[in-house]
Each structure stands twice: as C-alpha cells, then as structure tokens.
C-alpha cells in the first residue's frame, strides 16, 4: 500500500486529497489487472476468475454449526451449482466508459475512452471495446508481458474445493467449488507493496495510449491467488486506513464519488486475502472464540 | 512543504529531443503519480501524461510514439523526453502532482533553428 | 477524447459583482473536475476539484457546482485580484482534458 507522509485533513477543505485517492485506486487497480488483465484489458475470462477468486462467481453452500445443540447444520443457498456467469453480459455495462476514475485503457482504434472508476455504470457505453475497463487511472502495470494468459488459467479439473473455518460464535464453513491448490499459487511478486519500477525497454501495447515494459520475471501461470506465497502480504486495512490511505479524513460522511475511489482497494484487499488468517485444519488447535477472519471494520 | 522544481534547456532545434527533469519534495514519488502538461497559445492545455506510484505510465495517444516519463524514487526525479520536437511543440511543460494547486514552475521550451 | 467546452473566452465584470464561468463536457464525467486560476506568468492554481469542493486556502467567494457534463465557477463578490484566466480540466477519463480558458477582465 502507498503510505503517505503527508497531513492529509488540513490541506483539503473537502477532506479529501484528490491526489493521493486517484494515485492510490490507480495503485490498487494496477495490482488487480496485474493480476487478472493482459495487455492492459481485462478479458471476460479474466474478470470471471476476478469473481471467481474473490467468492462472488457463483452461488455458495455455507453449512453452519452452532455451538448450541438445537442448531445444528444450517443448510444456506443450496443451490451452490447456479453459476452466475451468465449475468455477465459481454461485459459492456460493466466496464463502460462513462463512470469516474481511474484507470483506463482505451482499444486500438486510438479513441482514448476510459473509465475511472469502481461501479461503471452510467452513460455513454455504446461502441464502446469491452476491453475499456480499466477505472479511471487503471494503469499499464509494469510487468504486462509478464500477466497470465488467460490460456494459462488453471483449468476446472485441476482445481480443488477448499474449506475456510471462521470460528466465532458458530462455526462457519464455507464450502468453495473452486479454489486453489497448494501447488498452484502465484509467485511471492503478485502483491507488493510498492512495485517497483522497471527499466527495462519500452513497446507500444496494442492498446493506444499506453506503453508497456517488456517483463523481466516469468510469466505467471493460472488466475489462481492466495497472499500466503507473499513475503512481504498487503496488510488488512479496516476502515479508518483505507480512508486515510486515500487521503480522506476518517469524520467525513462518504459521497458516491468518494466511495468509488475506494472500490479498486476493497476488491484488491479481498482478493488478496488480506484479512483472512488460514488456521490449522484440526479443530482441537482452535481455541474458543478465536477468529480466523480479522474484524476489519 | 510540497514543492516541484523543473529543470531543462529553454531551445531545442527541429527534430531533436527535449528532456525534463522534475525534482519533488514533500511527498514521495512511490505515493503520488506524477503528470505533465504543456500549455501553448494555439493549443492551450494538454495533458501529455503521468508516471504513477509503481513506475507505471499513462500517455496521451497523440503523444506516445514520441514520449518517455520514467522516474527515480531514490532521488524524487522524475525524467521527461519528448523526441522528434517540430515547431508546434514550442510551449510551457509543467509537471504537477494530479488535478491539484502542486505545479512545477513550468519550463518554457522554444523549438527553433 | 472528452471536449471541454468553455464558450465564452472572455467575461468582463466589476469589483462586487458576481460572474459565472461556465463549462461543458462532452461527455459525463460525473464530478471529476477541477477548475484552475492561472495569472499571467505563473502556473495553474487548483481552486476546487471533484467539481465543488474548494481546496484549502481558496476564499469562499470561489463556488464550484455541477456534474455529469455542465460545471460552473462562480465568482461572488469579485476582487481586483481576481482578474486571471480560468480554466475546467476533467479527470474522469485519459487523457485527461481542459477547457480552452475563460480570461476575467474586470472594468
């Protein structure tokens, strides 16, 4: 995460410093389309596997245990087989270039057309290139050559189902249908702090307004992410952090347009698995009342 | 106190490179992105591009073919150049930190023979 | 690439009065945008951003309104001081794009 050095409060009277919001959600979008993207566009398959890493791709079974007697295995949205892929439609209302902020990528055709920001839902979406989905200051990352190809992606079959355990109250079981094997996790570089810059040559990326750094690391293979290979892991920032790593001050009631400089952090700190602790599978080594996922709020 | 100081010649002949250096102080560069502007009579304000927190660059499609922002973190400068200059290309270059009152002092650069 | 449109290049107006510098986007750009006071020989000076918040420092007679594609800087109370070119610039899409300016005069 950038860290700032400078008050932020006293010098904006909106309580919000503009340049370090749209330089942090730039930061964080880049993280994303490092991750996901290709050639600075994210792909249907790449955003799918967005969802997919981050719980959302389709419907879940939870069973949840209760400690008391007369509760026990909640069945919740059985119908976890559902995908919901088909709600994606080609991706047009979803990345379409009218909203605010940050990071865009314009197509080939030199219309330099791209969105800002988180939720990208409002005007002017007609004709747009689906690949137009970088918010507004979504960002070339530096290592574009080095992004996993969406052929690359761990395939169905090679996935396995994982339980997380969030103990609280009741034991939570969260029973994902795809998600990562040990064997297939990305490289410790996926989300560093600050990335650092790369000098190696330039080329023009198919994508008009953007250059992109010929890679110096191996490409990664497969969609598939856990922040446990990391040596140096995006912390888990509660509210107050990521409000005051994007320059807005911790009193202020949020507007739409604020939030949205948010989304990119919030959707990379999921994704990142910031806030979750991955605990032993044997239960006798959980003590009571412990959580495994970090009160972040 | 955050401040951006320019430095860079003021005449280029046609057809040659233009280089800018833009010294920061007050925040740091792996924090903030870093833009460039021009401003000329004919054209008025252009934004050209930025180099953001990671070393990654956004540039204006007229401009790509011929511009090149990189930085040093280390020593809070942050590199423009701007190849092939004609002419039309005579105007002020500012670097500014985003949409915000931090503007260089501006580099007037004349491009002639 | 997104037009800013600012129609008038030039507003004239007295000490005391009240003017509005008007600004037209060609295409929504929500409230990304910042409006600059450039006078002559120096660099731009931010006055508001995310369309109607003013940066600190900026006297309260300088009011920012708008979203989506019209914005205005309104001017209350003008002072001799005031007497700059003004500029809209959005930030909502790349590459970023500015108005083409609006010079105040003040009679």
């Known amino acids: 995460f950038p860290q700032t050095t400078e008050k932020i409060s006293p010098n904006w009277e909106s309580g919000i410093n503009v340049d370090l919001a749209i330089s942090t959600r730039q930061y964080h979008l880049q993280q994303l389309f490092y991750r996901y993207g290709e050639n600075n566009s994210l792909s249907v398959e790449g955003f799918r596997k967005l969802l997919q890493n981050i719980g959302i791709d389709k419907i879940k079974r939870i069973h949840i245990h209760h400690d008391h007697d007369h509760h026990s295995d909640h069945e919740h949205h059985s119908d976890h087989e559902r995908h919901s892929d088909h709600e994606h439609h080609s991706e047009h209302e979803h990345h379409s270039d009218h909203d605010h902020h940050s990071h865009h990528n314009h197509a080939a055709s030199g219309k330099n057309k791209r969105k800002a920001l988180c939720p990208d839902h409002d005007s002017d979406s007609s004709g747009k290139d689906p690949r137009n989905s970088q918010g507004k200051g979504a960002h070339r990352p530096e290592h574009a050559s080095g992004r996993r190809n969406v052929k690359d992606s761990v395939s169905a079959s090679e996935v396995t189902s994982t339980v997380y355990n969030t103990v609280s109250e009741g034991t939570h079981f969260l029973e994902t249908i795809e998600t990562p094997r040990p064997g297939k996790l990305f490289p410790k570089d996926v989300s560093s702090s600050t990335p650092p810059s790369v000098t190696s040559k330039s080329r023009v990326s198919r994508l008009a307004g953007r250059k992109t750094n010929e890679s110096v690391s191996e490409p990664r293979k497969g969609f598939m992410y856990s922040r446990n290979t990391n040596e140096n892991p995006q912390e888990c920032f509660n509210a107050s952090k990521l409000l005051t790593s994007h320059g807005m001050g911790i009193q202020v009631p949020l507007n739409a347009t604020e939030f949205n400089y948010l989304c990119p952090a919030i959707i990379n700190q999921i994704d990142a698995r910031s806030c979750l602790i991955h605990t032993s599978e044997k239960k006798a080594e959980i003590p009571p009342k412990t959580y495994s996922l970090q009160i972040a709020w | 106190q955050v401040q951006l100081k320019q430095s860079g010649p003021g005449l280029v002949q046609p057809s040659q490179s233009l280089s800018i250096t833009c010294t920061v102080s007050?925040?740091?560069?792996?924090?903030?992105?870093v833009h460039w502007v021009r401003q000329s009579p004919g054209k008025g304000l252009e934004w050209l591009g930025v180099?953001?927190?990671?070393?990654?660059?956004d540039y204006n499609a007229a401009f790509i073919s011929r511009l090149s922002i990189s930085k040093d973190n280390s020593k809070s400068q942050v590199f423009f150049k701007m190849n092939s200059l004609q002419a039309n290309d005579t105007a002020i270059y500012y670097c500014?930190?985003?949409?915000?009152?931090?503007w260089g002092q501006g580099t007037l650069v004349t491009v002639s023979a | 690439d997104i037009v800013m449109t600012q129609s008038q290049k030039f507003m004239s107006t007295s000490v005391g009065d009240r003017v509005s510098v008007t600004c037209k986007a060609s295409?929504?750009?929500?409230?990304?945008v910042v409006w600059y006071q450039q006078k002559p020989g120096q660099s731009p000076k931010a006055l508001i951003h995310?369309?109607?918040y003013r940066y600190s420092g900026v006297p309260d007679r300088f009011t920012g309104s708008g979203s989506g594609t019209d914005f205005t800087l309104t001017i209350s109370n003008v002072q001799s001081e005031d007497l700059a070119e003004y500029f809209c610039?959005?930030?909502?899409?790349?590459?970023?794009?500015f108005g083409g300016g609006t010079k105040l005069e003040i009679k």
């Open positions: 500014a930190r985003g949409p915000s009152s931090y």
């Open positions: 007050g925040f740091s560069l792996t924090t903030y992105g």
């Open positions: 180099i953001w927190t990671g070393g990654t660059t």
């Open positions: 295409q929504n750009v929500d409230t990304n």
């Open positions: 995310s369309a109607s």
């Open positions: 610039q959005q930030y909502n899409n790349y590459p970023w794009t």
